[in-house]
């Protein structure tokens, strides 16, 4: 699986999850998030050669097409597969609110 | 929706479904498919600016991050959303077989 355990250890050049730390205030301008100050959102990148973690029959077909027609520029793309939520603390007036934001952290990638 | 109706009419530069005809024999080397000779597989391509058909909270966050940090090169990617099957005819010996291959045709795209 193209997950954080594998990708962060092996520094794969092909499609893999990459670490990306986002500081809410500095990187997004979100001053309303009190805690955490930032988090590892991560992202997916890297080429998708034929059969690499293909998501669907279409991505398999497209990968083969791209291998045999490299000038075609129609190839699968490396995108998130498994995502996890992030719990944040923010304030409404002086009232603290805890909320779980879904699909905030990429844990693995696929070629789609 | 970034579907064939919209994209094929408007020729959008941003993330959209693009027509791609694949000839089984010429483009894939698949001589075993008897009918059809080829089909419109289509594919997704184009930039994913902030909020364009964002798939998850993560793609929204990443789109904003990329807008504010354009040098970062971490941005969402345009990939298939809705796919449809394709029915093919092939032979095992002299026996004709009809099979439905799932997820063969891209009908719409999203930024993931």
């Amino acid at each position: 699986a193209l997950d954080t355990n594998y990708c962060f250890r092996n520094l794969e050049e092909n499609c893999c999850v990459r670490p990306l730390y986002i500081d809410f205030r500095q990187d997004l301008g979100w001053k309303w998030v009190h805690e955490p100050k930032g988090y590892y959102a991560n992202f997916c990148s890297g080429p998708c050669p034929y059969l690499r973690s293909a998501d669907t029959t279409h991505s398999t077909v497209l990968g083969l097409y791209n291998t045999l027609n490299p000038e075609a520029s129609a190839s699968p793309c490396c995108v998130p597969q498994d995502l996890e939520p992030l719990t944040i603390l923010y304030y409404v007036g002086r009232t603290p609110k805890v909320e779980q934001l879904s699909n905030m952290v990429v844990k693995s990638c696929k070629c789609s | 929706a970034l579907d064939t109706n919209y994209c094929f009419r408007n020729l959008e530069e941003n993330c959209c479904v693009r027509p791609l005809y694949i000839d089984f024999r010429q483009d894939l080397g698949w001589k075993w498919v008897h009918e059809p000779k080829g089909y419109y597989a289509n594919f997704c391509s184009g930039p994913c600016p902030y909020l364009r058909s964002a798939d998850t909270t993560h793609s929204t966050v990443l789109g904003l991050y990329n807008t504010l940090n354009p040098e970062a090169s971490a941005s969402p990617c345009c990939v298939p959303q809705d796919l449809e099957p394709l029915t093919i005819l092939y032979y095992v010996g002299r026996t004709p077989k009809v099979e439905q291959l799932s997820n063969m045709v891209v009908k719409s795209c999203k930024c993931s």
Epitope: F8, N10, D23 | A72, A74
Partner: nanobody
Framework: QLQLVESGGGLVQPGGSLTLSCLAS????????MSWVRQAPGKGLEWVSV????????HYSDSVKGRFAISRDNAKNTLYLQMNSLKPEDTAVYYC????????????RGQGTQVTVSS
């Protein structure tokens, strides 16, 4: 909050050596790849080296390959850069960066450490 504190820079003659350190806090250091980047006077950030989370896999830019060695001590939350055969063109502020800076041009989160190579 993620914090990175670099140290070990200084003035050194051409051909000399230095070892830079980076103490990390506010995240699980052992889970993530780490990089060194540098900024020469009047230039942008340049990727120097990256090391995988367990320290086994390492990559270097062509400009430092064979002269610099990246390492890490996960027990001490510390990243190192051993710099040998230093050249005047290595003069820069060196920053450690969370993640793999070949893929993301990380914002410099630490204060950096100045390395000056001059006779």
């Amino acid at each position: 909050q993620l914090q990175l504190v670099e140290s070990g820079g200084g003035l050194v003659q051409p051909g000399g050596s230095l070892t830079l350190s980076c103490l990390a806090s506010g995240f699980t250091f052992s889970h993530y790849p780490m990089s060194w980047v540098r900024q020469a006077p009047g230039k942008g950030l340049e990727w120097v080296s990256v090391i995988g989370s367990d320290g086994a896999i390492k990559h270097y830019s062509d400009s430092v390959k064979g002269r610099f060695a990246i390492s890490r001590d996960n027990a001490k939350n510390t990243l190192y850069l051993q710099m040998n055969s230093l050249k005047p063109e290595d003069t820069a502020v060196y920053y450690c960066a969370e993640g793999d800076s070949r893929y993301v041009r990380n914002r410099a989160r630490g204060q950096g450490t100045q390395v000056t190579v001059s006779s």
